[in-house]
């Protein structure tokens, strides 16, 4: 199956790479603008220059284009704990990330929040913290994993998933209670 091309892609595909069809005259192929610039005016005729202008501060284009406006620079989201890794330039958007010893949790394709890497207290590091994944912890005996932290089995209620891991401790607690009732 041939993928469906949008009108703009159809028009561009008639011209050689790096050029686009003049919107008013489909017999003219104009040279695309370099990254860091945008289209101010189409080329007046074959072999003539496209009028490209540099993006203004706060905007960018990251690839060759024939956009009428540069794209607005992204802002890092403070409320999500994001920090600026590199600032926006005319040919590259802002790069946002997390602080040291934090990882990114993606709530959706283009939205992430920074969280502290788990330290695996009362456990051992099974897999180290990575850019997009928290530390994977293995808990010591007498502890179970809850929200990626090792919690004492004394906090394990019978209805929770921890009961299998903490079964001996729960039975001990139950046994102590039983012996106290006689």
């Amino acid at each position: 199956l041939v993928p469906h091309l949008g009108d703009r892609e159809k028009r561009d595909s008639v011209c050689p790479q790096g050029k686009y069809i003049h919107p008013q005259n489909n017999s003219i192929c104009c040279t695309k603008c370099h990254k860091g610039t945008y289209l101010y005016n189409d080329c007046p005729g074959p072999g003539q220059d496209t009028d490209c202008r540099e993006c203004e501060s706060g905007s960018f284009t990251a690839s060759e284009n024939h956009l009428r406006h540069c794209l607005s620079c992204s802002k890092c989201r403070k409320e999500m704990g994001q920090v600026e890794i590199s600032s926006c330039t005319v040919d590259r958007d802002t790069v946002c990330g997390c602080r040291k010893n934090q990882y990114r949790h993606y709530w959706s394709e283009n939205l992430f929040q920074c969280f502290n890497c788990s330290l695996c207290l009362n456990g051992t590091v099974h897999l180290s913290c990575q850019e997009k994944q928290n530390t994977v912890c293995t808990c010591h005996a007498g502890f179970f994993l809850r929200e990626n932290e090792c919690v004492s089995c004394s906090n394990c209620k019978k209805s929770l998933e921890c009961t299998k891991l903490c079964l001996p401790q729960i039975e001990n607690v139950k046994g102590t209670e039983d012996s106290g009732t006689t």
Partner: nanobody
Framework: EVQLLESGGGLVQPGGSLRLSCAAS????????MVWVRQAPGKGLEWVSH????????YYADSVKGRFTISRDNSKNTLYLQMNSLRAEDTAVYYC????????????WGQGTLVTVSS
């Protein structure tokens, strides 16, 4: 005790509007970023929008951008979601929540409010 109470849902025709509210109590509302998430029938949770404590910074999922507006009134401890140009695919239970600290889960939820978009 933290409490979040959503209201304003209902049945609306495609293209119609609704305004959801979320009344918050039990924590310092103005200090917390707040989130609207939704769950369509048989689907997982979708992050719809969020707003920071002061109301200056907002975020919208691509699916609702230009149609939904999040806002808050810190004097009333209330979060809002104005939903315009509603579509059938907006049908879901809508929940408000605090922006998750310290890990990627929600500590408190409301009971949700059902929005049904149908002709």
């Amino acid at each position: 005790e933290v409490q979040l109470l959503e209201s304003g849902g209902g049945l609306v025709q495609p293209g119609g509007s609704l305004r959801l509210s979320c009344a918050a109590s039990g924590f310092t509302f103005a200090h917390e970023a707040m989130v609207w998430v939704r769950q369509a029938p048989g689907k997982g949770l979708e992050w719809v929008s969020h707003i920071d404590g002061g109301g200056e910074s907002t975020y919208y999922a691509d699916s609702v951008k230009g149609r939904f507006t999040i806002s808050r009134d810190n004097s009333k401890n209330t979060l809002y979601l104005q939903m315009n140009s509603l579509r059938a695919e907006d049908t879901a239970v809508y929940y408000c929540a605090r922006l998750p600290p310290p890990g990627p889960w929600f500590d408190y939820w409301g009971q949700g409010t059902l929005v049904t978009v149908s002709s």
